[in-house]
């Protein structure tokens, strides 16, 4: 999927600091579906929009995470933003990237790839971005995408740009990125896995 995660992030990044604080407080008391736990208060209150998106998706997965986010936004009186979030979640996905067998028809993935689970940490902590780009070039990244990532000034902005392409990626594309990470920054993958 990936699309729902990005839609949640877009919505949360469009909240003011005061609205984000209110969102977190409402999240502490919003009714949850049976079988789902609540994000601990201590961790929740200190999070920025990116970390909160990752926490929502890791706790509730993408589909329910987006639904829950929309419910809280509605409860805050932000009906339009909630509607945009749900509309974005249900849009069709883009074309399959170069070099990987595309499925006969695109289907929403119910689960989260390691790459999706740890998006925020990868954006913050990957340093060997050029190596990743070379490993992915022609397999997952087009020339245009490769150049766009390289043009970014810092490693986090490079990674953020790289992640802007992942909603169109299938599972095997994400595996190729993960393989490149295992080869270039194995300690980081190990560390994230333990977390």
């Amino acid at each position: 999927m990936g699309r729902a995660r990005d839609a949640i992030l877009d919505a949360l990044e469009n909240l003011t600091a005061e609205e984000l604080k209110k969102f977190k407080l409402k999240l502490l008391s919003v009714p949850l579906r049976e079988g789902y736990g609540r994000i601990p208060r201590g961790a929740l209150l200190s999070m920025d929009a990116l970390d909160l998106t990752d926490k929502l998706v890791s706790f509730y997965l993408e589909t329910y995470g987006a639904e829950l986010t929309a419910n809280v936004l509605r409860d805050m009186g932000l009906q339009e933003m909630a509607g945009q979030l749900q509309a974005a979640t249900h849009q069709g996905s883009g074309a399959a990237p170069a070099g990987i067998q595309a499925p006969p028809q695109s289907a929403a993935k119910p689960g989260l790839h390691f790459i999706d689970q740890h998006r925020a940490a990868l954006i913050a902590r990957v340093t060997n971005v050029e190596w990743l780009l070379d490993a992915l070039y022609g397999k997952v990244l087009t020339d245009e995408q490769y150049q766009a990532v390289r043009a970014e000034p810092t490693n986090p902005s490079k990674m953020r740009k790289l992640f802007s392409f992942t909603p169109a990626w299938n599972w095997t594309c994400k595996d190729l990125l993960l393989q490149a990470l295992r080869e270039s920054q194995s300690y980081l993958v190990e560390d994230l896995e333990r977390s």
Epitope: A96, A108, G111, L112, F114, N170, Q179
Partner: antibody
């Protein structure tokens, strides 16, 4: 509990194709990758590729690229491995396998089918 | 592709003895290695993953160690049911590859 049940033994002529099935149960089929590993008589294990039923994407060992096709039918929770242009050296036991979990940073195979013997002989 | 070389090809020991099996990778695979046990007519069985993690239900006499290119599977005190073929597998890069196996036989 997780179970992978494979189709029965096959005898095939050189040049023909074989399609082996693997029916999964005990977990959400679309949440985990299914891999295919083969073992020639008295030999070691060889990874052929995998499919992620959640989106239908597949990855193959380049050694088999063009000859192997892995597919999945979500409605029956069944994965398939088709190998074409068979030759005698394709005689082997073919296993489907599921990782411990697919969301980790690796694939270790905790669950295996019982194996399907494919014999290629003229 | 990454080549895994197991040694020895055959290991002859008695029940109660300690077994040490080795797996050497042709390039650095960090800790991304697992071990399997296979008995005749059966599918492989996962013992150890990520070099040293014991899989659920596997007896504590099995242990794994190593990182980089050299790995070891140790069986502290052999039981009669441990005599089988053991394979290592790397999970670092595609294609995933296995070692050629070590046959552990009764002396």
């Amino acid at each position: 509990q997780v179970q992978l049940v494979q189709s029965g033994a096959e005898v095939k002529k050189p040049g023909s194709s074989v399609k082996v099935s693997c029916k999964a149960s005990g977990y959400t089929f679309t949440d985990q990758t299914i891999h295919w590993v083969r073992q020639a008589p008295g030999q070691g294990l060889e990874w052929m590729g995998y499919i992620y039923p959640g989106d239908g994407s597949a990855m193959y060992n380049e050694k088999f690229q063009g000859r192997v096709t892995i597919t999945a039918d979500k409605s029956t929770s069944t994965a398939y491995m088709e190998l074409s242009s068979l030759r005698s050296e394709d005689t082997a036991v073919y296993y489907c396998a599921r990782p411990l979990y697919s969301y980790a940073s690796y694939y270790w195979f905790a669950y295996w089918g019982q194996g399907t013997l494919v014999t290629v002989s003229s | 592709e990454i080549v895994l070389t197991q040694s020895p090809a055959t290991l002859s020991l008695s029940p109660g003895e300690r077994a040490t099996l080795s797996c050497h990778a042709s390039q650095n695979i960090n800790v991304w290695l697992s071990w399997y046990q296979q008995k005749p007519g059966q599918a492989p069985r996962l013992l150890i993953y990520k070099s040293s993690n014991l899989h659920t239900g596997i007896p504590a006499r099995f242990s794994g160690s190593g990182s980089g290119t050299d790995f070891t599977l140790t069986i502290s005190s052999l039981e009669p049911e441990d005599f089988a073929v053991y394979y290592c597998q790397q999970g670092q890069s595609y294609p995933l590859t296995f070692g050629q196996g070590t046959k552990l036989e009764i002396k």
